[in-house]
């Protein structure tokens, strides 16, 4: 079941996945200039059995001036580069390795992909806040969001973080000084698709990745 | 010219329907996808649903979910959007949105449709 919503906007926040639950959607989307192929898959799909995730599909784009032609999809360093470096982009990640059963990581940049990514989740989703360069993080509780389903609606978990306007970046989970003993989550709430293992484990995972990969839904 | 022209907006009751239609010309709907967005005044423009073509992804805004449901014509060029159980708040102009990609929903999601429509203005009253 897809999230009806895109996870809260925090204040001089964003946000990013550490793996993709089963079922992910990402848009094929092109930069200026390019187009998605007319036969070209609309998204790319996580999909998976008990052993494996991997992303279904590939995105490709050409140029809006040559309908016909397919551009390869092995990225380029140049249009690497043109990513938004605020998102991270790790390259090296194999496509087809999951960290987590069920689950998916980043997919490898395309040629001539649109500089920010568009995310489908589904339910049971975590995603982590980290506030921008030059907000500093003040912890009430958990600095991340669960996408759940209540009563048949899917809501996402209000994460517990403010960003104040001072000189110094915040890092990622495992990394920070909280500023406060974190509480526990504000509301006490009965999921039905989310369990206390993805919460472990998600969390375990986001405090050793090394790599960090850093994406934002379309703002 | 691309033109697309929502129509069906009027003043209806709390509890009751309405049917908008979103007619699309200059462009083959069966390579876009369609969405609503809707601005009520002094707010700010708002996802409402939105359908590719391929029917692989239909979003809806959690406000809506239940009560609306976005579907469309592609040979007859045309999209739809039922409202049922309709609430004051749902009071608003609303617009048809399309695009040659993929889904694009949430908060600030209007950015990313390449043609809008002028919009029509749905009142409920309590």
């Known amino acids: 079941e897809l999230c009806d919503d895109d996870p809260p906007e925090i204040p001089h926040a964003t946000f990013k996945a550490m793996a993709y639950k089963e079922g992910t959607m990402l848009n094929c989307e092109c930069k200026r200039g390019f187009r998605r192929i007319k036969s070209g898959s609309l998204y790319m799909l996580c999909t998976g059995n008990s052993s494996h995730s991997s992303w279904d599909n590939q995105c490709q784009c050409t140029s809006s001036a040559t309908r016909n032609t397919t551009k390869q999809v092995t990225p380029q360093p140049e249009e690497q580069k043109e990513r938004k470096t605020t998102e991270m982009q790790s390259p090296m990640q194999p496509v087809d390795q999951a960290s987590l059963p069920g689950h998916c990581r980043e997919p490898p940049p395309w040629e001539n992909e649109a500089t920010e990514r568009i995310y489908h989740f589904v339910v049971g989703q975590m995603v982590y806040y980290q506030c921008v360069q030059g907000y500093r993080a003040l912890h009430r509780g958990p600095a991340e969001s669960v996408c759940k389903m209540t009563h048949g609606k899917t809501r996402w978990t209000q994460p517990q973080l403010i960003c104040t306007g001072e000189m110094e970046t915040s890092q990622f989970p495992g990394e920070e000084k909280p500023q406060a003993s974190p509480e526990g989550r504000p509301e006490s709430e009965t999921s039905c698709l989310v369990t206390t293992t993805d919460f472990q484990i998600q969390t375990e995972m986001a405090a050793t990745m090394e790599t960090s990969i850093f994406t934002t839904e379309y703002q | 010219e691309v033109q697309l022209v929502e129509s069906g907006g009027g003043l209806v009751q709390a509890g009751g329907s309405l049917g908008l239609s979103c007619a699309a010309s200059?462009?083959?709907?069966?390579?876009?996808?369609m969405a609503w967005f809707r601005q009520a005044p002094g707010k700010e423009r708002e996802f409402v649903a939105a359908r590719d073509w391929s029917d692989i992804i239909t979003r809806y805004a959690s406000s809506v979910k239940g009560r609306f449901t976005i579907s469309r014509d592609n040979a007859g060029n045309t999209g739809f959007l039922q409202m049922n159980s309709l609430r004051p708040e749902d009071t608003a102009v609303y617009y048809c949105a399309a695009r040659e990609g993929g889904v694009v929903a949430g908060v600030r999601s209007g950015a990313p449709y390449d043609y809008w429509g002028q919009g029509t203005q749905v009142t409920v009253s309590p």
């Open positions: 200059g462009i083959t709907f069966n390579d876009h996808t």
